[in-house]
Interface confidence: low
Protein backbone atom coordinates (compact mmCIF):
# COMPACT_ATOMS: atom_id res chain seq x y z
CA UNK A 1 0.00 0.00 0.00
CA UNK A 2 1.16 3.57 -0.07
CA UNK A 3 0.09 7.28 1.34
CA UNK A 4 -2.19 9.72 -0.32
CA UNK A 5 -1.36 13.24 0.62
CA UNK A 6 -0.53 16.34 -0.83
CA UNK A 7 2.59 18.14 -0.89
CA UNK A 8 1.18 21.67 0.17
CA UNK A 9 -2.18 22.57 1.84
CA UNK A 10 -3.05 26.36 1.51
CA UNK A 11 -5.89 27.91 3.58
CA UNK A 12 -6.85 31.90 4.35
CA UNK A 13 -5.53 32.86 7.93
CA UNK A 14 -8.97 32.13 10.18
CA UNK A 15 -10.13 28.88 8.60
CA UNK A 16 -10.04 25.30 8.67
CA UNK A 17 -7.16 23.01 7.16
CA UNK A 18 -7.77 19.71 6.09
CA UNK A 19 -4.08 17.69 6.45
CA UNK A 20 -5.09 14.65 4.29
CA UNK A 21 -3.22 11.22 4.97
CA UNK A 22 -4.89 8.37 3.38
CA UNK A 23 -3.88 4.76 3.30
CA UNK A 24 -4.26 2.73 -0.57
CA UNK A 25 -3.79 -0.27 1.09
CA UNK A 26 -4.55 -3.94 -0.58
CA UNK A 27 -7.76 -6.17 0.18
CA UNK A 28 -7.97 -6.97 3.63
CA UNK A 29 -5.30 -4.73 5.22
CA UNK A 30 -6.63 -1.81 8.12
CA UNK A 31 -5.36 0.90 9.81
CA UNK A 32 -4.13 0.47 13.57
CA UNK A 33 -3.62 4.48 14.26
CA UNK A 34 -2.59 7.29 12.49
CA UNK A 35 0.06 9.81 13.82
CA UNK A 36 -0.01 13.55 12.73
CA UNK A 37 3.19 15.53 14.36
CA UNK A 38 5.05 18.55 13.06
CA UNK A 39 8.31 18.48 12.09
CA UNK A 40 9.87 22.06 11.43
CA UNK A 41 13.24 21.29 10.45
CA UNK A 42 15.48 21.83 13.77
CA UNK A 43 12.87 22.08 15.87
CA UNK A 44 12.30 17.91 16.74
CA UNK A 45 8.59 16.85 16.32
CA UNK A 46 5.68 18.03 18.46
CA UNK A 47 2.45 15.39 18.95
CA UNK A 48 -0.90 17.04 17.31
CA UNK A 49 -2.95 13.91 17.51
CA UNK A 50 -3.21 10.41 17.56
CA UNK A 51 -6.48 8.59 15.56
CA UNK A 52 -6.95 5.05 17.14
CA UNK A 53 -8.97 2.91 14.96
CA UNK A 54 -10.34 1.34 18.46
CA UNK A 55 -9.86 4.39 21.16
CA UNK A 56 -10.63 7.37 18.85
CA UNK A 57 -9.12 10.66 18.46
CA UNK A 58 -6.89 11.96 20.89
CA UNK A 59 -5.59 15.47 20.55
CA UNK A 60 -2.52 16.85 22.53
CA UNK A 61 -2.74 19.15 25.32
CA UNK A 62 -0.67 22.01 22.83
CA UNK A 63 -3.51 21.45 20.75
CA UNK A 64 -6.64 21.27 22.61
CA UNK A 65 -10.25 22.03 20.59
CA UNK A 66 -8.03 22.76 17.48
CA UNK A 67 -7.58 19.64 15.73
CA UNK A 68 -10.70 17.12 14.87
CA UNK A 69 -11.46 14.07 12.59
CA UNK A 70 -13.48 15.05 9.07
CA UNK A 71 -17.16 15.27 9.26
CA UNK A 72 -19.11 11.47 8.98
CA UNK A 73 -19.39 9.51 7.07
CA UNK A 74 -15.26 8.44 7.36
CA UNK A 75 -13.46 5.89 5.52
CA UNK A 76 -11.40 3.55 8.37
CA UNK A 77 -8.42 4.29 6.02
CA UNK A 78 -8.81 7.60 5.86
CA UNK A 79 -6.37 9.50 8.59
CA UNK A 80 -6.91 13.16 7.72
CA UNK A 81 -7.34 15.73 10.47
CA UNK A 82 -9.05 19.54 10.41
CA UNK A 83 -6.53 22.17 11.94
CA UNK A 84 -9.44 24.83 13.16
CA UNK A 85 -9.01 28.55 12.47
CA UNK A 86 -5.59 28.42 11.36
CA UNK A 87 -3.30 31.16 12.55
CA UNK A 88 0.20 32.51 10.90
CA UNK A 89 2.21 30.26 13.10
CA UNK A 90 0.44 27.08 12.40
CA UNK A 91 2.78 27.26 8.87
CA UNK A 92 5.37 24.37 8.45
CA UNK A 93 6.06 20.65 8.36
CA UNK A 94 3.43 18.18 9.21
CA UNK A 95 4.07 14.39 9.21
CA UNK A 96 1.53 11.53 9.04
CA UNK A 97 2.67 8.10 10.39
CA UNK A 98 0.43 5.32 9.33
CA UNK A 99 0.67 1.89 11.67
CA UNK A 100 -1.37 -1.00 8.88
CA UNK A 101 -2.01 -4.11 9.24
CA UNK A 102 -0.35 -6.55 7.92
CA UNK A 103 1.69 -4.13 5.76
CA UNK A 104 3.61 -1.99 8.44
CA UNK A 105 4.23 1.50 9.16
CA UNK A 106 4.15 4.44 6.47
CA UNK A 107 4.89 7.99 6.88
CA UNK A 108 4.16 11.29 4.38
CA UNK A 109 4.61 14.77 4.70
CA UNK A 110 3.50 18.08 3.78
CA UNK A 111 4.03 21.25 4.35
CA UNK A 112 1.15 23.87 5.50
CA UNK A 113 1.12 27.43 4.09
CA UNK A 114 -1.42 30.03 5.96
CA UNK A 115 -2.30 32.57 3.76
CA UNK A 116 -2.54 36.14 5.49
CA UNK A 117 -4.35 38.61 3.12
CA UNK A 118 -3.61 42.25 3.36
CA UNK A 119 -4.97 45.61 3.82
CA UNK A 120 -3.26 47.88 1.88
CA UNK A 121 -3.23 51.43 2.39
CA UNK A 122 -2.82 54.62 0.14
CA UNK A 123 -0.96 57.32 1.45
CA UNK A 124 -0.34 60.52 -1.14
CA UNK A 125 2.86 62.61 -1.71
CA UNK A 126 3.36 66.34 -1.23
CA UNK A 127 1.08 68.48 -2.72
CA UNK A 128 1.54 68.57 -6.91
CA UNK A 129 2.52 71.95 -8.63
CA UNK A 130 3.37 71.93 -12.25
CA UNK A 131 6.98 73.03 -12.96
CA UNK A 132 8.38 70.53 -10.28
CA UNK A 133 10.08 67.90 -11.60
CA UNK A 134 9.80 63.88 -11.05
CA UNK A 135 7.27 64.05 -7.82
CA UNK A 136 5.85 60.99 -5.40
CA UNK A 137 2.78 61.33 -6.66
CA UNK A 138 1.25 58.54 -4.20
CA UNK A 139 2.80 55.61 -2.03
CA UNK A 140 0.79 52.16 -1.45
CA UNK A 141 1.77 49.48 1.19
CA UNK A 142 0.63 46.04 1.63
CA UNK A 143 1.51 43.59 4.41
CA UNK A 144 0.79 39.78 4.14
CA UNK A 145 1.67 36.34 3.48
CA UNK A 146 3.19 35.61 0.97
CA UNK A 147 3.93 39.01 0.04
CA UNK A 148 1.58 40.88 -2.20
CA UNK A 149 1.94 42.04 -5.34
CA UNK A 150 1.13 46.04 -5.50
CA UNK A 151 0.80 47.49 -9.02
CA UNK A 152 -0.69 50.61 -10.44
CA UNK A 153 -3.19 51.59 -12.52
CA UNK A 154 -3.94 54.89 -14.33
CA UNK A 155 -4.04 56.90 -17.26
CA UNK A 156 -1.30 59.27 -16.09
CA UNK A 157 2.02 59.08 -17.11
CA UNK A 158 4.82 57.96 -14.46
CA UNK A 159 7.36 55.91 -12.71
CA UNK A 160 6.96 53.48 -10.09
CA UNK A 161 9.86 51.94 -7.82
CA UNK A 162 8.91 49.36 -5.54
CA UNK A 163 10.50 47.81 -2.33
CA UNK A 164 9.94 45.32 0.60
CA UNK A 165 10.44 44.03 4.02
CA UNK A 166 10.70 40.91 5.15
CA UNK A 167 9.48 39.95 8.62
CA UNK A 168 9.17 36.60 10.33
CA UNK A 169 5.97 35.83 9.29
CA UNK A 170 4.92 38.29 6.44
CA UNK A 171 6.71 40.74 3.94
CA UNK A 172 5.36 44.57 3.52
CA UNK A 173 5.54 46.01 -0.13
CA UNK A 174 5.52 49.56 -0.95
CA UNK A 175 5.18 50.50 -4.15
CA UNK A 176 5.90 54.60 -5.04
CA UNK A 177 4.43 56.52 -8.16
CA UNK A 178 6.51 59.56 -9.39
CA UNK A 179 5.17 61.75 -12.03
CA UNK A 180 5.95 64.89 -13.84
CA UNK A 181 2.85 67.43 -12.52
CA UNK A 182 0.77 68.98 -15.28
CA UNK A 183 -2.51 70.52 -15.25
CA UNK A 184 -3.94 67.98 -17.66
CA UNK A 185 -3.49 65.53 -14.58
CA UNK A 186 -5.95 66.80 -12.48
CA UNK A 187 -8.73 64.76 -11.79
CA UNK A 188 -7.27 61.79 -12.89
CA UNK A 189 -7.68 58.53 -11.11
CA UNK A 190 -4.10 56.57 -9.54
CA UNK A 191 -5.35 53.27 -8.17
CA UNK A 192 -3.27 50.97 -6.53
CA UNK A 193 -4.08 47.26 -6.86
CA UNK A 194 -2.97 44.69 -4.43
CA UNK A 195 -3.16 41.27 -5.61
CA UNK A 196 -2.62 38.40 -3.55
CA UNK A 197 -3.56 34.29 -3.13
CA UNK A 198 -5.57 34.69 -0.10
CA UNK A 199 -8.32 37.47 -1.92
CA UNK A 200 -10.89 36.89 -3.52
CA UNK A 201 -9.94 39.58 -6.24
CA UNK A 202 -7.38 42.30 -6.19
CA UNK A 203 -8.35 45.37 -3.83
CA UNK A 204 -8.22 48.65 -5.28
CA UNK A 205 -7.48 52.13 -3.45
CA UNK A 206 -8.18 54.71 -5.91
CA UNK A 207 -6.63 58.26 -5.02
CA UNK A 208 -7.63 61.10 -7.42
CA UNK A 209 -4.50 63.16 -8.78
CA UNK A 210 -4.72 67.65 -8.17
CA UNK A 211 -2.20 69.63 -9.59
CA UNK A 212 -2.10 73.36 -8.43
CA UNK A 213 -1.11 75.11 -11.81
CA UNK A 214 -2.08 79.20 -12.69
CA UNK A 215 -2.01 79.77 -16.25
CA UNK A 216 -0.64 82.73 -18.49
CA UNK A 217 -3.49 85.72 -18.33
CA UNK A 218 -4.31 87.65 -21.18
CA UNK A 219 -6.94 90.10 -21.94
CA UNK A 220 -10.13 90.03 -24.35
CA UNK A 221 -12.33 92.86 -25.68
CA UNK A 222 -10.31 95.24 -27.75
CA UNK A 223 -10.15 93.15 -30.45
CA UNK A 224 -11.96 95.90 -32.46
CA UNK A 225 -10.32 98.84 -31.93
CA UNK A 226 -12.89 100.87 -33.87
CA UNK A 227 -15.21 100.38 -31.23
CA UNK A 228 -13.68 101.98 -28.85
CA UNK A 229 -14.74 105.40 -29.22
CA UNK A 230 -16.38 108.08 -27.02
CA UNK A 231 -20.22 107.52 -26.40
CA UNK A 232 -19.96 103.96 -26.34
CA UNK A 233 -21.59 102.03 -24.07
CA UNK A 234 -21.41 98.59 -22.24
CA UNK A 235 -17.50 98.14 -23.34
CA UNK A 236 -15.90 95.67 -21.10
CA UNK A 237 -12.56 93.96 -20.80
CA UNK A 238 -12.68 89.91 -19.83
CA UNK A 239 -9.21 88.63 -18.22
CA UNK A 240 -8.63 84.67 -18.88
CA UNK A 241 -6.89 82.66 -17.20
CA UNK A 242 -7.51 79.59 -15.35
CA UNK A 243 -5.54 77.68 -12.52
CA UNK A 244 -6.22 75.24 -9.86
CA UNK A 245 -7.16 76.19 -7.16
CA UNK A 246 -9.28 78.68 -8.74
CA UNK A 247 -7.77 82.27 -9.49
CA UNK A 248 -9.00 85.38 -8.07
CA UNK A 249 -9.00 88.20 -10.48
CA UNK A 250 -7.87 92.14 -9.34
CA UNK A 251 -8.10 95.38 -12.15
CA UNK A 252 -5.95 98.72 -11.68
CA UNK A 253 -5.12 101.15 -13.78
CA UNK A 254 -0.97 101.70 -14.14
CA UNK A 255 -1.44 105.63 -14.92
CA UNK A 256 -3.53 106.48 -12.15
CA UNK A 257 -6.93 105.03 -10.55
CA UNK A 258 -9.75 103.34 -12.05
CA UNK A 259 -11.63 106.11 -13.60
CA UNK A 260 -15.46 106.57 -11.67
CA UNK A 261 -18.01 104.34 -12.78
CA UNK A 262 -15.71 101.93 -14.18
CA UNK A 263 -17.39 98.14 -12.73
CA UNK A 264 -14.86 95.33 -11.62
CA UNK A 265 -17.35 92.01 -11.92
CA UNK A 266 -14.35 89.28 -10.75
CA UNK A 267 -13.19 88.99 -14.17
CA UNK A 268 -14.62 91.46 -16.13
CA UNK A 269 -14.33 95.37 -16.47
CA UNK A 270 -16.97 96.91 -17.36
CA UNK A 271 -16.88 100.69 -18.97
CA UNK A 272 -19.84 103.32 -18.63
CA UNK A 273 -20.34 105.63 -21.61
CA UNK A 274 -16.96 105.61 -23.03
CA UNK A 275 -15.09 109.17 -22.65
CA UNK A 276 -11.57 110.15 -23.30
CA UNK A 277 -10.70 109.85 -19.79
CA UNK A 278 -11.21 106.13 -20.00
CA UNK A 279 -7.85 105.88 -22.14
CA UNK A 280 -4.96 104.58 -20.24
CA UNK A 281 -2.85 101.17 -19.11
CA UNK A 282 -5.45 98.78 -17.64
CA UNK A 283 -3.96 95.70 -15.98
CA UNK A 284 -5.49 92.50 -14.57
CA UNK A 285 -3.84 90.55 -11.68
CA UNK A 286 -4.70 86.87 -11.25
CA UNK A 287 -3.17 84.59 -8.24
CA UNK A 288 -4.19 81.66 -6.51
CA UNK A 289 -2.08 79.76 -3.59
CA UNK A 290 0.15 78.84 -5.79
CA UNK A 291 1.06 81.50 -8.33
CA UNK A 292 0.16 84.87 -10.01
CA UNK A 293 0.34 86.42 -13.18
CA UNK A 294 -0.42 89.82 -14.89
CA UNK A 295 -2.00 91.12 -18.06
CA UNK A 296 -1.80 94.54 -19.28
CA UNK A 297 -3.86 96.57 -22.07
CA UNK A 298 -3.63 99.80 -23.64
CA UNK A 299 -7.17 101.57 -24.21
CA UNK A 300 -7.08 104.34 -26.38
CA UNK A 301 -10.50 105.92 -26.79
CA UNK A 302 -11.17 107.33 -30.15
CA UNK A 303 -12.83 110.59 -30.88
CA UNK A 304 -14.93 110.37 -33.98
CA UNK A 305 -14.39 114.00 -34.48
CA UNK A 306 -10.27 113.15 -35.30
CA UNK A 307 -9.29 111.06 -38.33
CA UNK A 308 -6.36 109.13 -36.13
CA UNK A 309 -6.49 105.38 -35.64
CA UNK A 310 -6.55 104.19 -32.80
CA UNK A 311 -3.35 102.61 -31.05
CA UNK A 312 -3.54 99.27 -28.91
CA UNK A 313 -1.00 97.32 -27.22
CA UNK A 314 -1.37 94.08 -25.63
CA UNK A 315 1.80 92.99 -23.67
CA UNK A 316 1.68 90.15 -21.00
CA UNK A 317 4.07 89.66 -17.60
CA UNK A 318 3.95 86.60 -15.63
CA UNK B 1 -28.26 20.50 -1.44
CA UNK B 2 -27.10 22.73 1.56
CA UNK B 3 -30.47 23.72 3.77
CA UNK B 4 -30.68 25.89 6.27
CA UNK B 5 -33.89 26.05 8.66
CA UNK B 6 -34.57 28.18 11.41
CA UNK B 7 -36.75 26.97 14.40
CA UNK B 8 -37.68 28.58 17.90
CA UNK B 9 -40.71 30.31 19.96
CA UNK B 10 -42.92 33.34 17.57
CA UNK B 11 -43.51 34.71 20.56
CA UNK B 12 -41.07 36.46 23.05
CA UNK B 13 -41.68 38.94 26.16
CA UNK B 14 -40.03 42.08 26.78
CA UNK B 15 -37.19 41.69 28.57
CA UNK B 16 -36.62 38.35 27.95
CA UNK B 17 -34.04 36.31 25.92
CA UNK B 18 -34.86 35.52 22.36
CA UNK B 19 -33.32 31.84 21.50
CA UNK B 20 -33.25 30.51 17.82
CA UNK B 21 -32.06 27.48 16.54
CA UNK B 22 -30.33 27.35 13.09
CA UNK B 23 -30.35 23.24 11.68
CA UNK B 24 -27.69 22.87 8.69
CA UNK B 25 -28.24 19.94 7.05
CA UNK B 26 -27.14 18.77 3.32
CA UNK B 27 -23.65 19.90 3.48
CA UNK B 28 -20.64 20.61 6.26
CA UNK B 29 -19.87 23.43 7.86
CA UNK B 30 -15.99 23.21 7.76
CA UNK B 31 -14.67 26.45 6.13
CA UNK B 32 -17.87 28.18 6.10
CA UNK B 33 -19.75 30.88 8.56
CA UNK B 34 -22.99 30.36 9.64
CA UNK B 35 -24.45 34.17 10.50
CA UNK B 36 -27.89 35.51 11.24
CA UNK B 37 -29.79 38.34 9.41
CA UNK B 38 -33.00 39.67 10.78
CA UNK B 39 -35.52 41.77 8.76
CA UNK B 40 -38.03 43.51 10.70
CA UNK B 41 -41.90 43.55 9.31
CA UNK B 42 -41.92 45.98 6.22
CA UNK B 43 -38.16 46.74 6.44
CA UNK B 44 -34.98 46.37 5.43
CA UNK B 45 -32.07 43.54 6.42
CA UNK B 46 -29.70 43.41 9.57
CA UNK B 47 -26.91 41.53 10.32
CA UNK B 48 -26.59 40.38 13.68
CA UNK B 49 -23.57 38.22 13.73
CA UNK B 50 -22.07 34.81 12.31
CA UNK B 51 -19.96 32.31 14.02
CA UNK B 52 -17.13 30.24 11.59
CA UNK B 53 -16.07 26.89 11.83
CA UNK B 54 -12.81 27.75 13.58
CA UNK B 55 -15.47 28.70 16.61
CA UNK B 56 -15.04 32.05 16.57
CA UNK B 57 -17.87 34.94 16.10
CA UNK B 58 -18.03 38.16 15.29
CA UNK B 59 -20.89 40.55 16.00
CA UNK B 60 -22.58 43.81 14.83
CA UNK B 61 -21.00 46.18 17.04
CA UNK B 62 -25.17 47.91 17.63
CA UNK B 63 -26.16 44.58 19.14
CA UNK B 64 -22.85 43.22 20.40
CA UNK B 65 -23.85 43.86 24.19
CA UNK B 66 -27.09 41.11 23.79
CA UNK B 67 -25.87 38.66 21.08
CA UNK B 68 -24.59 35.10 21.59
CA UNK B 69 -23.80 32.72 18.85
CA UNK B 70 -23.24 29.11 19.70
CA UNK B 71 -22.95 26.26 17.99
CA UNK B 72 -23.53 22.64 18.85
CA UNK B 73 -21.10 20.56 15.56
CA UNK B 74 -22.50 16.98 16.45
CA UNK B 75 -25.94 18.37 15.73
CA UNK B 76 -24.74 20.42 13.18
CA UNK B 77 -26.74 23.26 15.01
CA UNK B 78 -26.01 27.19 15.33
CA UNK B 79 -28.05 28.68 17.87
CA UNK B 80 -28.92 32.69 18.60
CA UNK B 81 -29.63 34.53 21.53
CA UNK B 82 -30.67 37.71 22.04
CA UNK B 83 -31.35 38.97 25.46
CA UNK B 84 -33.11 41.88 27.03
CA UNK B 85 -35.61 42.27 24.14
CA UNK B 86 -37.77 44.91 22.96
CA UNK B 87 -40.51 45.62 20.69
CA UNK B 88 -38.00 46.63 18.43
CA UNK B 89 -36.42 43.41 17.30
CA UNK B 90 -39.63 42.00 16.29
CA UNK B 91 -38.40 40.56 12.75
CA UNK B 92 -37.91 37.80 10.49
CA UNK B 93 -34.43 36.29 11.71
CA UNK B 94 -32.71 34.26 8.97
CA UNK B 95 -29.81 31.99 9.48
CA UNK B 96 -27.65 31.82 6.54
CA UNK B 97 -24.14 30.70 4.95
CA UNK B 98 -21.15 32.25 4.08
CA UNK B 99 -17.77 31.10 2.35
CA UNK B 100 -14.55 33.17 4.32
CA UNK B 101 -16.27 36.71 2.42
CA UNK B 102 -19.29 37.96 4.49
CA UNK B 103 -21.83 37.24 1.13
CA UNK B 104 -24.59 34.73 2.11
CA UNK B 105 -24.85 32.13 -0.72
CA UNK B 106 -27.41 29.82 0.74
CA UNK B 107 -30.35 31.50 3.62
CA UNK B 108 -33.50 29.63 5.72
CA UNK B 109 -36.69 30.22 5.19
CA UNK B 110 -36.66 32.72 8.15
CA UNK B 111 -38.96 32.64 11.09
CA UNK B 112 -40.86 35.43 12.97
CA UNK B 113 -40.78 36.24 16.15
CA UNK B 114 -42.67 38.75 18.06
CA UNK B 115 -41.72 40.78 21.62
CA UNK B 116 -45.45 41.19 22.87
CA UNK B 117 -46.69 41.00 26.82
CA UNK C 1 -19.91 51.43 10.29
CA UNK C 2 -20.17 52.46 6.57
CA UNK C 3 -23.68 53.38 5.42
CA UNK C 4 -25.06 52.12 2.10
CA UNK C 5 -27.65 54.46 0.39
CA UNK C 6 -29.60 52.85 -2.22
CA UNK C 7 -31.78 54.52 -5.10
CA UNK C 8 -34.12 54.42 -5.89
CA UNK C 9 -36.47 52.87 -3.40
CA UNK C 10 -38.78 52.15 -5.87
CA UNK C 11 -39.23 51.95 -9.72
CA UNK C 12 -42.19 51.23 -12.06
CA UNK C 13 -40.94 49.16 -15.11
CA UNK C 14 -42.64 47.37 -17.87
CA UNK C 15 -41.09 43.74 -18.96
CA UNK C 16 -38.45 43.95 -21.34
CA UNK C 17 -37.26 47.12 -19.97
CA UNK C 18 -33.61 47.65 -19.06
CA UNK C 19 -33.59 48.38 -15.19
CA UNK C 20 -30.45 50.18 -13.16
CA UNK C 21 -30.33 49.63 -9.55
CA UNK C 22 -27.36 52.19 -7.76
CA UNK C 23 -25.82 51.81 -4.12
CA UNK C 24 -23.60 54.10 -2.87
CA UNK C 25 -21.48 53.71 0.21
CA UNK C 26 -19.58 55.96 2.54
CA UNK C 27 -16.48 54.99 2.00
CA UNK C 28 -14.52 52.86 -0.54
CA UNK C 29 -15.49 49.39 0.15
CA UNK C 30 -12.95 47.68 -2.75
CA UNK C 31 -15.72 45.98 -4.56
CA UNK C 32 -16.77 43.74 -1.45
CA UNK C 33 -20.11 44.14 -2.70
CA UNK C 34 -23.22 41.74 -2.95
CA UNK C 35 -26.30 42.26 -4.47
CA UNK C 36 -29.92 39.96 -3.34
CA UNK C 37 -33.05 39.38 -4.57
CA UNK C 38 -36.02 38.89 -2.21
CA UNK C 39 -40.10 38.19 -2.90
CA UNK C 40 -42.84 38.47 -0.18
CA UNK C 41 -42.31 36.06 2.65
CA UNK C 42 -39.34 34.45 1.08
CA UNK C 43 -36.00 34.77 2.44
CA UNK C 44 -33.63 37.08 0.13
CA UNK C 45 -31.53 35.26 -3.20
CA UNK C 46 -27.61 36.23 -4.19
CA UNK C 47 -26.97 37.57 -7.73
CA UNK C 48 -23.66 39.36 -7.48
CA UNK C 49 -20.96 39.03 -5.12
CA UNK C 50 -18.09 40.85 -5.34
CA UNK C 51 -19.30 43.80 -6.84
CA UNK C 52 -19.21 41.90 -11.10
CA UNK C 53 -19.56 37.85 -10.09
CA UNK C 54 -22.80 36.50 -10.75
CA UNK C 55 -24.24 33.62 -8.37
CA UNK C 56 -24.58 30.42 -9.74
CA UNK C 57 -27.72 29.97 -11.19
CA UNK C 58 -28.43 32.98 -12.27
CA UNK C 59 -29.76 34.49 -15.36
CA UNK C 60 -26.90 36.55 -17.61
CA UNK C 61 -29.56 39.28 -17.62
CA UNK C 62 -28.34 40.27 -14.37
CA UNK C 63 -25.16 41.60 -14.09
CA UNK C 64 -23.12 43.70 -11.16
CA UNK C 65 -20.63 47.03 -11.64
CA UNK C 66 -18.87 49.91 -9.75
CA UNK C 67 -15.69 50.03 -7.81
CA UNK C 68 -14.73 52.43 -4.67
CA UNK C 69 -17.84 53.56 -3.39
CA UNK C 70 -20.66 53.66 -5.98
CA UNK C 71 -21.91 50.11 -7.62
CA UNK C 72 -24.51 49.40 -9.79
CA UNK C 73 -26.91 46.26 -10.40
CA UNK C 74 -28.48 46.12 -13.84
CA UNK C 75 -31.21 43.96 -14.99
CA UNK C 76 -30.77 44.22 -19.41
CA UNK C 77 -34.45 42.98 -20.30
CA UNK C 78 -36.66 42.67 -17.15
CA UNK C 79 -38.80 39.57 -16.72
CA UNK C 80 -42.41 39.02 -15.15
CA UNK C 81 -40.18 36.94 -11.99
CA UNK C 82 -37.85 40.00 -11.75
CA UNK C 83 -40.59 41.87 -10.09
CA UNK C 84 -39.17 41.94 -6.27
CA UNK C 85 -37.09 44.22 -3.53
CA UNK C 86 -33.56 44.31 -4.14
CA UNK C 87 -30.92 45.00 -1.39
CA UNK C 88 -26.70 46.10 -2.18
CA UNK C 89 -24.72 44.85 1.21
CA UNK C 90 -20.79 45.20 1.66
CA UNK C 91 -18.99 42.87 2.87
CA UNK C 92 -15.59 45.31 3.62
CA UNK C 93 -15.93 45.18 7.76
CA UNK C 94 -19.32 45.21 9.69
CA UNK C 95 -21.64 44.04 6.93
CA UNK C 96 -24.85 46.68 6.01
CA UNK C 97 -27.76 46.73 3.67
CA UNK C 98 -28.92 49.22 1.20
CA UNK C 99 -32.69 50.26 1.95
CA UNK C 100 -33.79 48.15 -0.73
CA UNK C 101 -35.23 48.66 -4.18
CA UNK C 102 -39.07 47.82 -4.92
CA UNK C 103 -39.24 47.33 -8.77
CA UNK C 104 -43.13 47.09 -9.71
CA UNK C 105 -45.04 46.74 -12.51
CA UNK C 106 -46.03 49.42 -14.90
Known amino acids: GELETSDVVTVVLGQDAKLPCFYRGDSGEQVGQVAWARVDAGEGAQELALLHSKYGLHVSPAYEGRVEQPPPPRNPLDGSVLLRNAVQADEGEYECRVSTFPAGSFQARLRLRVLVPPLPSLNPGPALEEGQGLTLAASCTAEGSPAPSVTWDTEVKGTTSSRSFKHSRSAAVTSEFHLVPSRSMNGQPLTCVVSHPGLLQDQRITHILHVSFLAEASVRGLEDQNLWHIGREGAMLKCLSEGQPPPSYNWTRLDGPLPSGVRVDGDTLGFPPLTTEHSGIYVCHVSNEFSSRDSQVTVDVLDPQEDSGKQVDLVSAS | QVQLQESGPGLVKPSETLSLTCTVSGGSLTNYGVHWVRQPPGKGLEWIGVIWSGGSTNYNPSLKSRVTISRDTSKNQVSLKLSSVTAADTAVYYC???????????WGQGTLVTVSS | DIQMTQSPSSLSASVGDRVTITCRAS??????LAWYQQKPGKAPKLLVYAATNLADGVPSRFSGSGSGTDYTLTISSLQPEDFATYYC????????FGGGTKVEIK
Open chain 3, 27 to 32: ENIYSN
Open chain 3, 89 to 96: QHFWGTPT
Open chain 2, 96 to 106: ARSGKWYYFDY
